[in-house]
Interface confidence: low
């Protein structure tokens, strides 16, 4: 069964910069991948951005660098000014489109305990949902 | 250059529903983001919401959240604005705009605009 | 939701005078804001973007200054094609526009 998981970073020298990283553990080819915050896209949530593998990028302020890491991972970097800046607890969803498995959708958010700059390995998210 | 070109004129009763259209010619239309505002008579300009045609997905202002749909048919390189629930105070110009960035910066703007809709809501 | 609060909401100059409109972000944007200039009937026109860039084919005698939550637009010599109405937008999330100002011929 495909996996999506999230890891979530606050940098070290920006308090208000945060690093989101995705990916997708499946055998199928990603055809897009959609990140939000405050909850999954069409759910509440806010895109943050859009990476499609052809196509190319496209981010929503307050996200400054998206990018592909691997075939299967993303990240994207948060800049936040005032009114943008994520809260500790802030939620950032991962949507995975991919043929032949479909939508694949996982949360995460920085955790309790974190220091800027440090986090724990990224695990697979529950999977929210799959289309 | 990118051209938008906007649906014609509506006028709509109250209650009822309106679907306005914005076709983008000579540039790319999938990669950018399509945004609407409004501007009601002798009034500012408000941002409804936008979308992003290469995944179809749409963020909206608080305001007008359940009530505005934003979809996009990158086939025809055409952005739709449909908002429910009419009523008199929806009377205003409707605008479709790209919404332009420049590289990996997070500095975004309107450029260009459609030459906009108007509608009407009147019993 | 982040507002932005334009002054004055109108005013009258001359041919030649040189105008300051200012726009206030309700928190602190950056430098994520656009002004735009709107005639009557005919669709808004990017002038300036991230606060200060010149939008291609705007004549210099516009600029745009300032970061946080206080901007300013001003045209060092008013044209005759510069009576108009004027939004400031802000991009820091999402986005907002100013509620106007009309610059009208005295």
């Known amino acids: 069964t495909p996996e999506v998981w999230v890891q979530v970073r606050m940098e070290a020298t920006e308090l208000s910069s945060f690093t989101i990283r995705c990916g997708f553990l499946g055998s199928g080819s990603i055809s897009l991948v959609t990140v939000s915050w405050g909850g999954p896209n069409g759910a509440g949530g806010t895109t943050l951005a859009v990476l499609h593998p052809e196509r190319g990028i496209r981010q929503w302020a307050p996200a400054r660098q998206a990018r592909w890491e691997t075939q299967s991972s993303i990240s994207l970097i948060l800049e936040g000014s005032g009114a943008s800046s994520p809260c500790a607890n802030t939620t950032f969803c991962c949507k995975f489109a991919s043929f032949p498995e479909g939508s694949w959708e996982a949360c995460g958010s920085l955790p309790p305990s974190s220091d800027p700059g440090l986090s724990a390995p990224p695990t697979p998210a529950p999977i929210l949902r799959a289309d | 250059q990118v051209q938008l070109v906007q649906s014609g004129a509506e006028v709509k009763k109250p209650g009822s529903s309106v679907k306005v259209s914005c076709k983008a010619s000579g540039g790319t239309f999938s990669s950018y983001a399509i945004s609407w505002v409004r501007q009601a008579p002798g009034q500012g300009l408000e941002w409804m919401g936008g979308i992003i045609p290469i995944s179809g997905t749409a963020n909206y202002a608080q305001k007008f959240q359940g009530r505005v749909t934003i979809t996009a048919d990158e086939s025809t390189s055409t952005a739709y604005m449909e908002l429910s629930s009419l009523r008199s105070e929806d009377t205003a110009v409707y605008y479709c705009?790209?919404?332009?960035?420049?590289?990996?910066?997070?500095?975004?703007?309107?450029?260009?605009w459609g030459q906009g809709t108007l509608v009407t809501v009147s019993s | 939701d982040i507002q932005m609060t334009q002054s004055p909401s109108s005013l009258s100059a001359s041919v030649g005078d040189r105008v300051t409109i200012t726009c206030r972000a309700s928190q602190s944007i950056s430098s994520y804001l656009n002004w735009y200039q709107q005639k009557p009937g005919k669709a808004p026109k990017l002038l300036i973007y991230?606060?200060?860039s010149l939008q291609s084919g705007v004549p210099s005698r516009f600029s745009g200054s300032g970061s946080g939550t206080d901007f300013t637009l001003t045209i060092s010599s008013l044209q005759p094609e510069d009576f108009a109405t004027y939004y400031c937008?802000?991009?820091?999330?999402?986005?907002?526009f100013g509620g106007g100002t009309k610059v009208e011929i005295k």
């Open positions: 937008q802000q991009s820091d999330i999402l986005y907002t």
């Open positions: 991230a606060a200060s």
């Open positions: 705009a790209r919404d332009t960035g420049r590289g990996y910066t997070r500095h975004f703007w309107f450029d260009p």
